[in-house]
Interface confidence: low
């Protein structure tokens, strides 16, 4: 099957990196500079993707693979194979159409994108407030008043833990 | 073959400003960054930062954003670095060398010797 | 900046052994990392890309692996012409930077 295919199309034959050249006998020519194509058998390259302004090239583009982009230090990816870049915001805080916003009162965040979430509602479980919550930080329920009668043991908060990923640079 | 073609030395006085070369050859210089590298004696790597020659776009490390200029000439598929204000400190080997994320071919290097 | 750190500052072994280079990074950096080996009086010379990928022309016993901050460089039976300084160096954010270096020694 394979070699009736290349009989009949001649352009089977030709590798990733590059296409079939019409105006050339369907010869295979390479993929010209800055773009590429990552299967056989293609009739033209594909463009590279260029990784610039606030996106920065991950993985450089080759004559088989496109280019891959991430975010400039202070920015973050959005969408399939980082088609955006959102700015980043402190932990404690929201981006809105207007910039960086500190979270309301009664919500947290403790990442640098995404949005502000309420705190536990620690009292729907049946549970008191151990430790307060925080603009960066959600609040730490602990037992019920019932289950701190004398005798029962103390509880020690946990103390906070690093987020990974947010370490300073 | 991919060569990166930098001057032996350069001997200069301090104050004054130095331009040192990366002749490109064997691959199509306006596809590849061109960074720069500096290399105190019996020390380490420092990046000083690189130049896309396609747009001329550059990207510096800060310590060097007053010392180091990064210029290409696409005719010539020439680098240049000038380096401005010199002292002692700037006594160094310097390298060029090709590529994006991982620096894959390298030239040889120019020792700077700054010296009244 | 990202701190690189290398360690040990000197590895001596002898020939035949398998060395291990460490570099860990000061932040998360997935698998951003090159390795170099420096001759004496050379240019460094690219021996891994992206933590673990092989580059064409150099020798199979060098290897790399690791990612998010942890990376190691691998060489299996080490020869006499191996006596290098290595450096890795990450690429995950301007600027560049290297780690301080290993020396490798022959015993």
């Known amino acids: 099957f394979e070699r009736t295919r290349s009989l009949q199309d001649p352009c089977s034959n030709c590798p990733a990196g590059t296409f079939c050249d019409n105006n050339r006998n369907q010869i295979c020519s390479p993929c010209p500079p800055n773009s590429f194509s990552s299967a056989g058998g293609q009739r033209t390259c594909d463009i590279c993707r260029q990784c610039k302004g606030v996106f920065r090239t991950r993985k450089e583009c080759s004559s088989t693979s496109n280019a891959e982009c991430d975010c400039t230090p202070g920015f973050h990816c959005l969408g399939a194979g980082c088609s955006m870049c959102e700015q980043d915001c402190k932990q404690g805080q929201e981006l809105t159409k207007k910039g960086c916003k500190d979270c309301c009162f009664g919500t947290f965040n403790d990442q640098k994108r995404g949005i502000c979430r309420p705190w536990t509602n620690c009292s729907l479980d049946g549970k008191s407030v151990l430790v307060n919550g925080t603009k960066e930080r959600d609040v730490v329920c602990g037992p019920s008043p019932a289950d701190l009668s004398p005798g029962a043991s103390s509880v020690t908060p946990p103390a906070p833990a690093r987020e990974p990923g947010h370490s300073p640079q | 073959q991919v060569q990166l073609q930098q001057p032996g030395a350069e001997l200069v006085k301090p104050g004054a400003s130095v331009k040192l070369s990366c002749k490109a050859s064997g691959y199509t210089f306006t596809n590849f960054w061109i960074n720069w590298v500096k290399q105190r004696p019996g020390q380490g790597l420092e990046w000083i930062g690189n130049i896309y020659p396609g747009n001329t776009g550059t990207n510096y490390n800060e310590r060097f954003k007053t010392k180091a200029t990064l210029t290409v000439d696409i005719s010539s598929s020439t680098a240049y670095m000038r380096l401005s204000s010199l002292t002692s400190e700037d006594s160094a080997v310097y390298y060029c060398a090709r590529g994006q994320l991982g620096l894959d071919y390298w030239g040889q290097g120019t020792t700077l010797t700054v010296s009244s | 900046d990202i701190l690189l750190t290398q360690s040990p500052a000197i590895l001596s072994v002898s020939p035949g052994e398998r060395v291990s280079f460490s570099c860990r990074a000061s932040q998360i950096i997935g698998t951003t990392i090159q390795w170099y080996q420096q001759r004496t009086n050379g240019s460094p010379r690219l021996l891994i890309k992206?933590?673990?990928e092989s580059l064409s022309g150099i020798p199979s016993r060098f290897s790399g692996s690791g990612s998010g901050t942890d990376f190691t460089l691998s060489i299996n039976n080490v020869e006499s012409e191996d006596i290098a300084d290595y450096y890795c160096q990450q690429s995950h954010s301007w600027p560049f930077t290297f780690g301080s270096g290993t020396k490798l020694e022959i015993k």
């Open positions: 992206y933590a673990s």
